[in-house]
């Protein structure tokens, strides 16, 4: 139940409270406020201080993780006196019960899998639940399809990523009838967790002196244009001695993705395969199917 934040607090306390769903820290407003400030300190003594207008009695923390425990602090000055109040936000529950080894990846442009492991001290009846909030915090996505291990949720599959933004907050809560279960939370960038498909429509056409490789950029979850891709071509002569170096060629993305290389007839049997990456991160996709060209008697 939300109270009216504009009410005047008793002189002794600011009545600081935190809503983890909205990441909003609020306190009772003081008459004739001249200065107010809110911040949090994490276990590593890092301080996060959001911007705050003087007349506000709340502040919102945008990009924070809470599972290690944080301390919120509010300082308010009025024309009469100053107020300070701390609010501890611990990760209550038994140590070691939270989900661990949490990771997510986006694949096939519109699917996402998240996986985690049961906490080492979690009881047998533990159950985990995943919630995702986008950076705009407008909506919360509950996991629609859980991956289970002996009845315990250890992963989640999403086939609708429309609610995600470029940066998202992931929260894994836990429940048990026996003990309190700690939560785990994480902030992930979609650009860093997307695994590209290999390039498609790979073709090779040769004339007497050259071969031209063409391909199409992979479809991706992120809205990218051709220069946002980097490619690697593996041109490989068949039936060579083991340990012979493959020719790896780096090619920048272009409007028409192509690579032309000298290869004169008679041409030995070769294969070519291509992989793609985000030019910023170089997280390579798997290789495309190998395309063969040339002849055995070349």
């Amino acid at each position: 139940e939300k109270s009216d934040l504009r009410t005047v607090a008793p002189a002794s306390s600011l009545n600081v409270r935190f809503d983890s769903r909205t990441m909003n820290l609020s306190w009772d407003c003081q008459e004739n406020t001249t200065f107010s400030k809110c911040f949090l300190t994490d276990k590593k003594n890092r301080v996060v201080e959001p911007r705050l207008s003087n007349n506000e009695c709340s502040c919102t923390f945008r990009e924070i993780c809470l599972h290690e425990g944080v301390t919120f602090e509010v300082h308010v000055n009025t024309s009469q006196r100053g107020f300070q109040q701390k609010l501890l936000y611990p990760n209550s529950g038994r140590e070691g019960t939270a989900a661990q080894n949490f990771s997510c990846f986006i694949y096939n442009a519109d699917l996402m899998n998240c996986t985690w492991a049961r906490g080492p001290t979690a009881p047998r009846d533990v159950q985990y639940f995943l919630y995702i909030r986008n950076s705009k915090r407008r909506r919360e996505i509950r996991c629609p399809y859980y991956i289970q291990d002996s009845g315990t949720h250890v992963g989640c599959h999403l086939d609708n990523l429309s609610g995600l933004t470029s940066r998202n907050y992931f929260l894994v809560n836990g429940t048990s009838r026996e003990i309190g279960i700690q939560f785990f939370d994480s902030l992930l960038d979609t650009k860093k967790i997307e695994r590209f498909n290999p390039p498609s429509n790979v073709t090779v056409r040769c004339n007497t002196t050259h071969c031209l490789v063409r391909w199409k950029q992979p479809r991706t979850y992120q809205k990218l244009s051709y220069l946002d891709f980097q490619y690697q071509l593996d041109v490989h002569r068949k039936n060579t001695q083991p340990g012979t170096e493959n020719l790896l060629i780096n090619v920048s993305g272009d409007l028409e993705n192509r690579y032309n290389f000298p290869s004169s007839e008679p041409r030995a049997k070769h294969s070519v395969k291509i992989r793609a990456a985000d030019v910023r991160i170089l997280n390579w996709s798997s290789w495309s199917e190998a395309i063969e060209f040339g002849s055995d008697d070349g």
């Epitope: 992120q222 809205k223 244009s225 051709y226 220069l227 946002d228 409007l255 030019v279 910023r280």
Partner: antibody, heavy 120, light 111 residues
Framework: QVQLVQSGAEVKKPGASVKVSCKIS????????IHWVRQTPTKGFEWMGG????????VYAQRFQGRVTMTEDTSIDTAYLTLSSLRSDDTAVYYC?????????????WGKGTMVTVSS | QAVLTQPSSVSGAPGQRVTISCTGS?????????VSWYQQLPGTAPKLLIY???KRPSGVPDRFSASKSGTSASLAITGLQADDEADYYC???????????FGGGTKVTVL
């Protein structure tokens, strides 16, 4: 090879409107993000707006909001820029270009430019 | 007044190395947003030379290189040639203006 062919030079009176076209050949307009940038001797290059793939819509620079309209006719692979309520300081070369990188907002492939002169 | 500041001109003899600076602020280059560089030969449209701070589109010679540090970026041209004589512009997104901005341009003269 992709080419952006722009319409010819225009001379307009203050208060009038101008419509500049940009015909894409060698590639389908529906697969591209077209942006408009103008260049003046005094202000240099000014980005005016264009199709933002992340927003999935045409976005405009604040300073031209209300005066500029960008449209596309994908059936003839042509993009259009209309600037209304023209003033003398709108005298510039207007370029269409392709957004080659969404993440860097880099413009690759440019038209040759359309000179628009606003004079009474 | 351009949001990104460049020197108005630099010059060098053929074969020399010249660098062009581009100074921004915490709302653009330092935010950090990526920097692109363009070359504009006299009477022609700009040509993209560098994007993502240091990547070259295919067809741009490796004599052109770029880097970025803090709130500024720089473009280097090694082995300067007569046909490098042109205007060079940097570009970056600016979160305060909420749009992409260009530098005022630097004229490179080959002596």
């Amino acid at each position: 090879q992709v080419q952006l062919v722009q319409s010819g030079a225009e001379v307009k009176k203050p208060g009038a409107s101008v419509k500049v076209s940009c015909k894409i050949s060698g590639h389908s307009l529906s697969e591209l993000s077209i942006h408009w940038v103008r260049q003046t001797p005094t202000k240099g290059f000014e980005w005016m707006g264009g199709f933002d793939p992340e927003e999935n819509e045409i976005v405009y620079a604040q300073r031209f909001q209300g005066r500029v309209t960008m449209t596309e006719d994908t059936s003839i692979d042509t993009a259009y820029l209309t600037l209304s309520s023209l003033r003398s300081d709108d005298t510039a070369v207007y370029y269409c270009s392709i957004l080659g990188s969404v993440t860097a907002w880099a413009f690759d492939y440019w038209g040759k430019g359309t000179m628009v002169t606003v004079s009474s | 007044q351009a949001v990104l500041t460049q020197p108005s001109s630099v010059s060098g003899a053929p074969g020399q190395r010249v660098t062009i600076s581009c100074t921004g602020s915490g709302s653009n280059i330092g935010a950090p947003y990526d920097v692109s560089w363009y070359q504009q030969l006299p009477g022609t449209a700009p040509k993209l030379l560098i994007y993502h701070n240091n990547k070259r589109p295919s067809g741009v010679p490796d004599r052109f290189s770029a880097s970025k540090s803090g709130t500024s970026a720089s473009l280097a041209i090694t082995g300067l040639q007569a046909d490098d004589e042109a205007d060079y512009y940097c570009q970056s997104y600016d979160s305060e203006d909420r749009m992409t901005e260009f530098g005022g341009g630097t004229k490179v003269t080959v002596l």
